[in-house]
């Protein structure tokens, strides 16, 4: 029987060009974690395998950093990074536990108000 729960950073927002930490925490279970996958919609961002350590998908390696812990740091954010992110804990004997985070990437305040500072 699955007894665990996943706590996540929930719905978060960040500025374009900045960085954000995605965090999940599995609690209330004695299940052993064998692997954690980080996915964005249908794309794999990274894997943290209990034996092999971290693997970052080649298409994200310039903008994704492992950690802290089992979390994931996204850098050089763009508006296209807005969307759902999933932390997928693979465990035995419980099975899969999934946490969902929604990230909204906002235009930076400088970009929003840039017109005021333009020289005519």
């Amino acid at each position: 029987m699955m007894t665990g729960t996943i706590e996540t950073t929930g719905n978060i927002s960040a500025e374009k060009g900045g960085s954000i930490i995605l965090q999940c925490h599995l609690s209330s279970t004695t299940a052993q974690v064998t692997q954690v996958n980080w996915e964005q919609q249908d794309q794999l961002l990274a894997i943290c395998n209990a034996d092999l350590g971290w693997h970052i998908s080649p298409s994200f390696k310039d903008r994704v950093a492992p950690g802290p812990g089992l979390g994931l740091t996204l850098q050089s954010l763009t508006v296209n990074d807005t969307g759902e992110y999933f932390c997928i804990y693979h465990t035995y004997p419980d099975g899969t536990y999934t946490g969902r985070i929604f990230l909204e990437v906002l235009e930076s305040s400088v970009a929003e108000h840039g017109a005021r500072f333009q020289i005519p």
């Epitope: 064998t34 692997q35 996915e39 794999l44 209990a50 997928i88 419980d94 899969t96 999934t98």
Partner: nanobody, 118 residues
Framework: EVQLVESGGGLVQAGGSLRLSCAAS????????MGWFRQAPGKEREFVGA????????YYADSVKGRFTISADNAKNTVYLQMNSLKPEDTAVYYC???????????WGQGTQVTVSS
């Protein structure tokens, strides 16, 4: 959802061996661990063992350690459960299971009957 097809069950005498196979319909980055569970008549389904696709690390319940071995053939998307020194108490329906996506828990096969006679 991952579709799983088991084979290899049957009737065997105590002390004998059987090998169960489980083929997965898909092989995606989400398919992390595959495992085996069993359910004896009147009992709850129990964990037998599992294997992680990436590391090929294996994990076993204490009751089968040293007797059962899980292995994987990545090319065939198939996992195996080699069962040696079988005992009558190993009699159960054996289910293949996979962790294949964002849904919680396991995806399950239909199960295959293993009967160990004394």
């Amino acid at each position: 959802e991952v579709q799983l097809v088991e084979s290899g069950g049957g009737l065997v005498q105590a002390g004998g061996s059987l090998r169960l196979s489980c083929a997965a319909s898909v092989r995606t980055f989400s398919l992390s661990d595959m495992g085996w569970f069993r359910q004896a008549p009147g009992k709850e389904r129990e964990f037998v063992g599992a294997i992680n696709w990436l590391s090929e690390s294996t994990y076993y319940a204490d009751s089968v350690k040293g007797r059962f071995t899980i292995s994987a053939d990545n090319a065939k998307n198939t996992v195996y459960l080699q069962m040696n020194s079988l005992k009558p108490e190993d009699t159960a329906v054996y289910y293949c299971a996979a962790q294949g996506g964002v849904l919680s828990g396991w995806d399950w096969g239909q199960g295959t009957q293993v009967t160990v006679s004394s």
